[in-house]
């Protein structure tokens, strides 16, 4: 039953991503859709060798990683403000888990290029749009309400063959012939459908 | 203007042990790996260890390990070097280096630390 | 570890005459696009100074009298015209893979 509430939700939550509306925007799918989350791609120039990736909401940093080279090569991978994150040889990639509207915003990715020099930072974003479908919206409209009302029949259905039950079992003590009375009635009934259909 | 300053140097008895010191200014300390050589009266540069960002990855040289310890306090802005076990031949001047991305791009003037008996 | 050699010990060259210090390494410090090579000045009585990195690239305030070339495990430090101010050690370093080492370095005086 969880899961499939959970399927549900994920079907209920769309993403859309508007690229080209800002300076530096990303020429690539910068946000894959996945799990109930979002990974956030950001890329850089396989040529980079030690740099410092932000992720910013708005102004805001959500998530950083830097990754510098000592003087015998070793790599040091280090997060100040830290997320879910992965690193491969041209990307950084920040993932965003249970998503509602409050994550629709503009997402930018912000590169300090320490090495090689000279110092650089590139700016690329995009904006992370969260709907919900019209379908899905009435979806979640009437589905309450259907299931409101199928407890209420349940309910109502129980108490009626509860009330069935208990006028049956009174009347059956009160009249000794009321089962076959009952019977007689409903064989009649039979026989006259029956000469109905042939007429 | 990046300014590294060692102190600590000394003469010492075989065996002994020294603490140097390396107090950085004029950039983001906490920023940069960090890195220690030594250069013997009239020889060449000698690597001796490095020490990255927040200090969890620290290297040493074959002639040093074991013997020699590289810490850093970012909170001070502060590079060591704790050395045990001293020996004749770890006599020298050691530099404290920034390790500027892709080479030694910033030096102190040195402390001289002479191990003899 | 990687060994450096450096070619000549000593060389004396006039003023305004070129100076060429060759360095060689024991195994190739190139990975991807990048030389792992640098170069260093030394001053009598002063710290080593950064001059050349990636076996090419002037640092900052190097003048472009000096510059670096080769690739692989053979490489040359060239001063085109020497100054008076140029007299010092050369010590060639790799930071291909750790330990660092430097070369035994090169005395450049004027003749």
């Known amino acids: 039953m969880k899961s499939g509430l959970w399927y549900f939700f994920l079907f209920c939550l769309r993403i859309k991503v508007l690229t080209g509306e800002i300076n530096g925007s990303a020429n690539y799918e910068m946000f894959i859709f996945h799990n109930g989350g979002v990974q956030i791609l950001c890329k850089y120039p396989d040529i980079v060798q030690q740099f410092k990736m932000q992720l910013l909401k708005g102004g805001q940093i959500l998530c950083d990683l830097t990754k510098t080279k000592g003087s015998g090569n070793t790599v040091s991978i280090k997060s100040l403000k830290f997320c879910h994150s992965q690193l491969s040889n041209n990307s950084v990639s920040f993932f965003l888990y249970n998503l509602d509207h409050s994550h629709a915003n503009y997402y930018f990715c912000n590169l300090s290029i320490f090495d090689p020099p000279p110092f650089k930072v590139t700016l690329t974003g995009g904006y992370l749009h969260i709907y919900e479908s019209q379908l899905c919206c009435q979806l979640k409209f009437w589905l309450p309400i259907g299931c409101a009302a199928f407890v209420v029949v349940c309910i109502l259905g129980c108490i009626l063959i509860c009330w069935l039950t208990k006028k049956k079992y009174s009347s059956s003590v009160h009249d000794p012939n009321g089962e076959y009375m009952f019977m007689r009635a409903v064989n009649t009934a039979k026989k006259s459908r029956l000469t109905d259909v042939t007429l | 203007e990046v300014q590294l300053v060692e102190s600590g140097g000394g003469l010492v008895q075989p065996g002994g042990s020294l603490r140097l010191s390396c107090a950085a200014s004029?950039?983001?300390?906490?920023?940069?790996?960090m890195d220690w050589v030594r250069q013997a009266p009239g020889k060449g540069l000698v690597w001796v260890s490095n020490?990255?960002?927040?200090?969890?990855?620290?290297e040493y040289s074959p002639f040093v390990k074991g013997r020699f310890t590289i810490s850093r306090d970012n909170a001070k802005n502060t590079l060591y070097l704790q050395m045990n076990s001293l020996r004749a031949e770890d006599t020298a001047v050691y530099y404290c280096?920034?390790?500027?991305?892709?080479?030694?791009?910033?030096w102190g003037q040195g402390t001289l630390v002479t191990v003899s008996s | 570890d990687i060994v450096m050699t450096q070619s000549p010990d000593s060389l004396a060259v006039s003023l305004g005459e070129r100076a060429t210090i060759n360095c060689k390494s024991s195994q190739s410090l190139l990975s991807g696009s990048f030389n792992y090579l640098t170069w260093y000045q030394q001053k009598p009585g002063q710290p080593p100074k950064l001059l050349i990195f990636?076996?090419?690239t002037r640092h900052t305030g190097v003048p472009d009298r000096f510059s670096g070339s080769g690739s692989g495990t053979d490489f040359t430090l060239t001063i085109s015209s020497l100054q008076a101010e140029d007299v010092a050690v050369y010590y060639c370093h790799h930071h291909y893979n750790a330990p660092p080492t430097f070369g035994p370095g090169t005395k450049v005086d004027i003749k």
């Open positions: 004029g950039f983001t300390f906490s920023d940069y790996w």
């Open positions: 020490i990255d960002e927040d200090g969890s990855i620290t």
């Open positions: 280096t920034r390790w500027g991305r892709f080479g030694f791009d910033s």
């Open positions: 990636y076996a090419s």
